[in-house]
């Protein structure tokens, strides 16, 4: 904490410039007014001040503002935004999407904070839902901000934005992420052609029940190997040899060296050997030619 | 994380000259350049003169004229020329210099003594 001491004659700031950065700790504190500072907060960070010099600043704004800054003060912290706690950013309002972007700039590059964590919480909440506009820009900033959300907080993107989601954007997701985006995906490409729709849907299938499977079996849309093992493996499981052998279509040569692996692994398990045999490649460890396969999933559901 | 050392300080008679260098250990990725502060006992650090990203220079008003920021970025090194040399510039010189993730990195100082 700065002590309170006078303004030394001569001293007083009569705007933001960068004769500040000479003043010590104490004289900031003395010498430069806070509304004045709220007022010219866009000039702050052309000046190159040291963090330390950055927390008297913080410290003026907190006394100014005690129940949180106004929008007018956040856009323009710029580097000032690394002093915030997240208690500090709790207090806002932000709904301007240019504030959010002046933000996430300082950030840039590197992971997320807790501050830019709780900052995009605070706007999203304030919007009510995750937009295409608001979801654009946090996915350019962190790719990876869709799969950090839960499913809960996923149910709250509306289809029209799933149009924002680039294919690395989902690379961390889980299961329960993806069946919950992928319902979204499939009502937003709707009404896209069938090369095109597979296309744009492609990075979402790892939420894909087994009928749709089926049908872009029959859409000789060549699914890559890549895309197939990320397929739930309950969705895989109940897919005929034939129908795998459509949806890869060139690609399925690549099932022999996935047959460790699942889901390929335990659809192997589940086919028979004689249908397997069909497609060339050696799979081995499907079901012996004679025997009988209960489904006891179907015997549980009737009993 | 980038190491900052300091020196040529020592003890000079007034209207005498000292150079003081900072070597960093590698390349710094400072917001702000690098600066050269000091402190005296009981007082609060202040900045002397700072030598920005592009090369522009800023010098507190006490010591216009006299002292000069440089840097030789083939050696990773600021100096501050310090000329005509006064008690009150008598203190621990520091370098230091800003990130781009909220902290402040000094050097650990050298002393300059400015006494007849």
């Known amino acids: 904490e700065v002590e309170k001491t006078a303004c030394p004659s001569g001293k007083k700031a009569r705007e933001i410039d960068e004769s500040l950065i000479f003043y010590k700790k104490w004289e900031l504190e003395a010498c430069v007014d806070a509304a004045l500072l709220a007022t010219q907060m866009d000039r702050v960070n052309a000046i190159p001040f040291t963090y330390e010099q950055l927390d008297v600043l913080k410290h003026k704004l907190d006394e100014l503002y005690p129940q949180g800054y106004p929008e007018s003060v956040i856009q323009h912290l710029g580097y000032l935004f690394l002093k915030m706690s997240p208690e500090d950013i709790r207090k806002w309002n932000v709904t301007s999407l240019e504030t959010l972007k002046a933000l996430l700039e300082v950030n840039k590059g590197h992971e997320m904070s807790p501050q830019v964590a709780t900052l995009i919480d605070r706007f999203v909440k304030g919007r009510g839902q995750l937009d295409k506009d608001t979801l654009d820009t946090l996915t350019a900033f962190y790719p990876g901000y869709l799969c950090s959300l839960s499913p809960e907080e996923l149910s709250s993107v509306p289809p029209s934005s799933i149009w924002a989601v680039r294919p690395q954007d989902l690379d961390t997701c889980d299961p329960r992420q993806l069946d919950v985006l992928y319902p979204k995906a499939r009502l937003a490409f709707q009404n896209m052609n069938g090369s095109e729709y597979f296309v744009k849907i492609q990075s979402f299938l790892g939420g894909a029940p087994t009928e749709d499977l089926k049908a872009l079996s029959q859409q000789n849309v060549s699914m890559d190997l890549a895309t197939f093992m990320k397929l739930r493996t309950d969705a895989v499981l109940p897919l005929t040899v034939a129908e795998v052998q459509k949806l890869l279509g060139p690609h399925v040569e690549g099932l022999k060296a996935e047959e460790r692996h699942r889901p390929v692994r335990d659809w192997i398990l589940r086919q028979r050997q004689d249908d397997l045999d069909t497609l060339g490649l050696g799979l081995q460890g499907g079901i012996p030619n004679g025997y009988l396969v209960l489904d006891l999933s179907m015997q549980e559901a009737l009993s | 994380q980038v190491q900052l050392v300091e020196s040529g300080g020592g003890v000079v008679q007034p209207g005498g000259s000292l150079r003081l260098s900072c070597a960093t250990s590698g390349t710094i990725f400072s917001r702000n350049g690098m600066g050269w502060f000091r402190q005296a006992p009981g007082k609060q650090r202040e900045l002397v003169a700072r030598i920005l990203n592009d090369g522009t220079t800023m010098y507190a008003d006490s010591v216009k004229g006299r002292f000069t920021i440089s840097r030789d970025n083939s050696k990773n090194t600021v100096y501050l020329q310090m000329n005509s040399l006064k008690p009150e510039d008598t203190a621990v010189y520091y370098c230091?210099?800003?990130?781009?993730?909220?902290?402040?990195?000094w050097g650990q100082g050298t002393q300059v003594t400015v006494s007849s």
């Open positions: 230091g210099y800003s990130d781009y993730r909220g902290t402040d990195y």
